[in-house]
């Protein structure tokens, strides 16, 4: 038994062009958290449960708000380690998935929205009890720096946490053939129950007399390294030192298969045999299943009962993406017609329509004049989604129901007096002015500014406005 520990050092933009935009904004502050999933890297093992070695979720990091215009910095991280306890032997080779999640802290319907920012996967060889191993992984434009280690929980010790330590029976030294338990020097290694001669470094046992090998080792006592290249390779010159043929360049050189996949040559190229939990041409895709809980924001995981069948997330309205990690800004599609205001309520879109329009998307232009009578001989005019009455002379108001006082607006200029008349208004102009609204001065020599006075009217006569 023991604990796998993961320490995230930084998460931020990777080197090179195309720096990612900050995942948080002043409008949508957010915080990060991480998820780690561990699987044993024994490719020959039968179908194991997802995250068979265990999984862990970090605490939420500090709330972060983007500084406008600034490039995305390394983002503030949660405190502490991610710890994944393991009950049995440490397998020596393991595969990991580390996900970086963003929790949006805006006003969310149905709780905070989670979205997957980055997912990295890898396969590593690691002995328990060793020092921290440092790693850098890139996912798109993001870069994750982290360290990890596996440590045994007392009384277990060794590279696989399978040897047991017991308190010393004598104060000075351990019994015959038994070593002190580093780093617990005051304890002694318990008598080995594995098969005699089983390699303490590369073998372990869970039953007395057994010798099971860590990946990369074989033989009855786990002392023989598994050969990575055959000495029967037909390519290249013979090596004098080993008697083996040194392979020349081939499609599998440098092993193009990621995550511990094994490469085999084909007539045209190569083929990767991927360990369970990974797939793709180069085993670059991690085989997450529904049991790993890949669907966020209330998404339902469909299919994907095992790593060989892909899962699909059915996303609730308002979310999209392969993991329902993206909030849909449905108003950005401008669904409301005729100037309607768009409201995204989470479960539905609402359009607030301008006067004169109706329908779910304000698509119906109401007949503004339908059923609207303009009184006193007025006529209805449609326009801009609102009805208007053009009133007959002497009437006004929205529906032409008000008798108009034509003199209310003081239409006669230069001190002229206004008289209401059955056909409109009449201005009696002050001396020196003339015109329908007394707008024209009469010249001192008796000529007016008008080309000619209308017949029957002398300058100074009341002017009737027609």
């Amino acid at each position: 038994a023991g604990v796998f520990e993961l320490q995230i050092h930084s998460f931020g933009p990777g080197p090179g062009p195309g720096a990612p935009r900050s995942p948080c904004s002043a409008r949508l502050p957010c915080r990060l958290f991480f998820r780690v999933c561990l699987k044993p890297g024994l490719s020959e093992e039968a179908a194991e449960s997802p995250c068979a070695l265990g999984a862990a979720l970090s605490a939420r990091g500090p709330v972060y708000t983007e500084q406008p215009g600034a490039p995305a910095p390394d983002l503030p991280l949660p405190d502490g380690l991610l710890q994944v306890p393991f009950r049995d032997a440490w397998p020596g080779t393991f595969s990991f998935i580390i996900e970086t999640w963003r929790e949006e802290l805006g006003d969310q319907i149905g709780g905070p929205a989670w979205s997957l920012l980055a997912r990295v996967a890898g396969r590593r060889r690691l002995a328990a009890g060793g020092p921290w191993a440092r790693d850098i992984q890139r996912a798109g434009a993001w870069e994750l720096r982290f360290s990890y280690r596996a440590r045994c929980e007392p009384p277990a010790v060794g590279t696989a946490c399978t040897r047991l330590c017991r308190p010393r029976s004598a104060p000075s030294r351990c019994g015959p053939g038994l070593r002190p338990c580093a780093p617990l020097e005051d304890e002694c290694e318990a008598p080995l129950v594995c098969r005699a001669g089983c390699s303490p470094e590369h073998g372990f046992c869970e039953q007395p007399g057994e010798c099971r090998c860590l990946e990369g080792w074989t033989g009855p006592l786990c002392t023989v390294p598994v050969s990575t290249s055959s000495c029967l390779s037909p390519r290249g010159p013979s090596s004098a030192t080993t008697g083996c043929l040194v392979p020349g360049p081939g499609p599998c050189d440098g092993n193009p298969c990621a995550n511990g996949g094994s490469c085999s040559e084909t007539p045209r190229s190569f083929e990767c045999t991927c360990p369970r939990g990974f797939y793709g041409l180069r085993c670059e895709v991690s085989g997450v299943t529904c049991a790993d809980g890949p669907c966020f924001n209330g998404g339902l995981c469909v299919g994907g009962a095992d790593p060989d069948s892909a899962y699909i997330c059915h996303c609730p309205p308002g979310f999209q993406g392969s993991n329902c990690e993206k909030r849909v800004d449905r108003c950005s599609l401008q669904p409301c017609r005729n100037g309607g205001l768009c409201l995204d309520l989470g479960h539905a879109l609402r359009c607030r329509c301008r006067a004169g329009f109706a329908g779910p998307r304000c698509e119906h232009d109401l007949d503004d004049c339908a059923g609207r009578a303009c009184a006193n001989g007025g006529t209805c005019v449609e326009g801009g989604g609102a009805h208007r009455c053009s009133c007959a002379l002497g009437f006004g108001g929205r529906d032409c129901r008000e008798r108009a006082d034509p003199c209310a607006a003081r239409p006669c200029a230069h001190g002229g007096r206004c008289y209401a008349h059955f056909s409109g208004l009449v201005c009696a102009c002050a001396p020196g002015y003339m015109g329908a609204r007394c707008e024209f001065p009469v010249h001192p020599d008796g000529a007016s500014a008008l080309p000619a006075a209308p017949p029957g009217l002398r300058p100074g006569d009341p002017q009737r406005y027609l």
Epitope: C290, D292, G298, L300, P316, P317
Partner: antibody
């Protein structure tokens, strides 16, 4: 107020197709997933399947070969067809709305009893 | 599929007492995607709890949900006469959506 109303024949002959319709009021059928659930007399609840207005469907594997759920957005309705029925399909059939926060059921119809008998 | 097992099958209590209903999943339910419903005779089920612990709109605070992973609990404190009914749990983590077999809460 969201309301769902199931309609359809209460009696279906064995080997025939059971057809039910759910009429929704108070909510747009285009804004939610919609589901069918059934309950044999005196027994527990069994999810049949759901549909989204876009045409996305998901059915219970135990019934998948016999089930079709469709949607009519113009009528704000969705429908269930269950073929080759037997007496074991006798149940109260409920239509329900799937919530926004996840695939659980926040509004239910009152249910309609369908008896399979010759 | 995730099989949900509810216990006890029947629970006999008196008004004013507290009821504890259990729902156990055959596999871990991610993100606590679990809901509880109440069903009275001749009626459709009514949503009580979602997300394992969030009360649905209009549900009195004497109903509370808890748990995570594979073990979930519905607690009804101070039982009222109208609380005697059948209660179902439902997981919505993955397809197919599944319900528990139900717990009948009856008056002692």
């Amino acid at each position: 107020q969201v309301q769902l109303q199931e309609s359809g024949p209460g009696l279906v002959k064995p080997s025939e197709t059971l057809s039910l319709t759910c009429t929704v009021s108070g909510a747009s059928i285009s804004s939610f997933y919609w589901s069918w659930i059934r309950q044999p007399p005196g027994k527990g609840l069994e999810w049949i399947g759901y549909i989204y207005y876009s045409g996305t469907t998901n059915y219970n594997p135990s019934l998948k070969s016999r089930v079709t759920i469709s949607v009519d957005t113009s009528k704000n309705q969705f429908s269930l067809k269950l073929s080759s029925v037997t007496a074991a399909d006798t149940a109260v059939y409920y239509c329900a709305r799937i919530a926004v926060a996840g695939f659980f059921f926040d509004y239910w119809g009152q249910g309609t009893l369908v008896t399979v008998s010759s | 599929e995730i099989v949900l097992t509810q216990s006890p099958g029947t629970l006999s209590l008196s008004p004013g007492e507290s009821a504890t209903l259990s729902c156990r999943a055959s596999q871990s339910v991610n993100k606590n995607y679990l809901a509880w419903y109440q069903q009275k005779p001749g009626q459709a089920p009514r949503l009580l709890i979602y997300g394992a612990s969030s009360r649905a709109t209009g549900i009195p605070d004497r109903f509370s949900g808890s748990g995570s992973g594979t073990d979930f609990t519905l607690t009804i404190s101070r039982l009222e006469p109208e609380d005697f009914a059948v209660y179902y749990c439902q997981q919505y983590d993955r397809s197919p959506l599944t319900f528990g077999g139900g717990t009948r809460l009856e008056i002692k």
